[in-house]
Every structure is written in structure tokens, then in C-alpha cells.
């Protein structure tokens, strides 16, 4: 788990683009806000993440959805699918 | 499963310079997006200090930007990383990356040693 800290001068995401590329995995946790995550999960699949930059955003969304994803969320999860285990599949109510 | 080679790392004292190379093995290289990390020790993350377009358009890391150039020569398949003005903390292994979503394939590295 990514050490909580606080985000750097400017480095607070306004929206979720490839700048995040550069962002190393703790100003990810600590710049990226998770409820804007969630509205623009579109774009993660179209941005060029390492593997472990993914397992932030996952973090993020896991925080927020304690009790398992929305659907908005789980139609756009792309490359983060990987990422999901078994448990986090079964908390997902699906229609 | 696309093979990238890296080249070019040693031990350079501090001030000094090195050219790193990441030859590919894809024919359609020159539609790639590629980048070039560098990882400081084992199990640490992996850090992206500069990106280069299919236009040659480039991006660096805050940490690099003036001091660190990246070029590309798309009928050698390679890209390339000039690092001027060396620092003990750019020591690490340089990996290069085609900056594909999905893609999280690694070459070797290429080590790169800073002594002060």
C-alpha cells in the first residue's frame, strides 16, 4: 500500500490525462482525486500505465467503493480488470 | 512479443555524460510511443523520466528536464537517451518501454552508475 502523503504544489490532477504517466505511484495516491477517477475511467484505458501505477488507481476505487464498484465504473474498467480479484468480482452487482 | 534491447549504461563520474540506446525488434517501430524509465534499486518502482512520440515529440520528468534528451532514429528501430550533467541520483537501471496501454513488457536494463 502506497504511504499516505500530501500532494506536492501544483501537482493536484484537474482531470485525468497522460500527464499521470510521470506521476510516481505515492503522488498518484496522494493527487488524484478518486471520485474524478471514477467519472473518467474511460481515459485510464487509453493512457499508457506501468502495471504498478494501476494498483493505485484500483486503491483509489477500492477506497471509494468499500462495498464493491458501480456499474458506470465497471463498464469502463479496461486494463484494470486485471487487477480484480475473485472477492472484488463477487461485490459487484451486476444486472 | 516485441524484444527491446538497452545499451549504452556504465560508470561515469558526476558532471559526466552517457548515451543510452534501446534498439526494438517490431518492423512498425516507428509508430511507437516509447519512454524511457529508470528504476534506482531492486523492487522500487519504476520512474519515467522522458517519452517520444511517432511525431518526435517529447516529455521528461521534471528531475531531468534540461540535463537529458531523447531522440529516436526510426530506421534503426532505436531510441535514444542522452544524459548530460550527471547526478549520484540518476544511478539505476534504465529501462526503455513502448507506452502502450496494456503493454508491460520490460527488456534487461541497462545499469547506469554516478560516482560523486
Known amino acids: 500500500e502506497v504511504e499516505k502523503t500530501a500532494c506536492p504544489s501544483g501537482k493536484k490532477a484537474p482531470e485525468i490525462d497522460e500527464s499521470l504517466i510521470f506521476y510516481k505511484k505515492w503522488e498518484l495516491e496522494a493527487c488524484v482525486d478518486a471520485a474524478l477517477l471514477a467519472t473518467q475511467m474511460d481515459r485510464v484505458n487509453a493512457i499508457p500505465f506501468t502495471y504498478e501505477q494501476l494498483d493505485v488507481l484500483k486503491h483509489k476505487l477500492d477506497e471509494l467503493y468499500p462495498q464493491g464498484y458501480p456499474e458506470s465504473v465497471i463498464q469502463h474498467l479496461g486494463y484494470l480488470f486485471l487487477k480484480m480479484s475473485p472477492e472484488d468480482i463477487r461485490k459487484w452487482n451486476v444486472t | 512479443q516485441v524484444q527491446l534491447v538497452e545499451s549504452g549504461g556504465g560508470l561515469v563520474q558526476a558532471g559526466g555524460s552517457l548515451r543510452l540506446s534501446c534498439t526494438a525488434s517490431?518492423?512498425?517501430?516507428?509508430?511507437?510511443?516509447m519512454g524511457w524509465y529508470r528504476q534506482e534499486a531492486p523492487g522500487k518502482e519504476r520512474e519515467l523520466v522522458a517519452?517520444?512520440?511517432?511525431?518526435?515529440?517529447?516529455n521528461y520528468a521534471d528531475s531531468v528536464k534540461g540535463r537529458f534528451t531523447i531522440s529516436r532514429d526510426n530506421a534503426k528501430n532505436t531510441v535514444y537517451l542522452q544524459m548530460n550533467s550527471l547526478k549520484s541520483e540518476d544511478t539505476g537501471v534504465y529501462y526503455c518501454?513502448?507506452?502502450?496501454?496494456?503493454?508491460?513488457?520490460w527488456g534487461q536494463g541497462t545499469q547506469v552508475t554516478v560516482s560523486s
Open positions: 518501454r513502448i507506452m502502450r496501454p496494456g503493454n508491460w513488457y
Open positions: 517490431e518492423s512498425g517501430f516507428s509508430a511507437n510511443y
Open positions: 517519452t517520444i512520440n511517432r511525431f518526435g515529440s517529447t
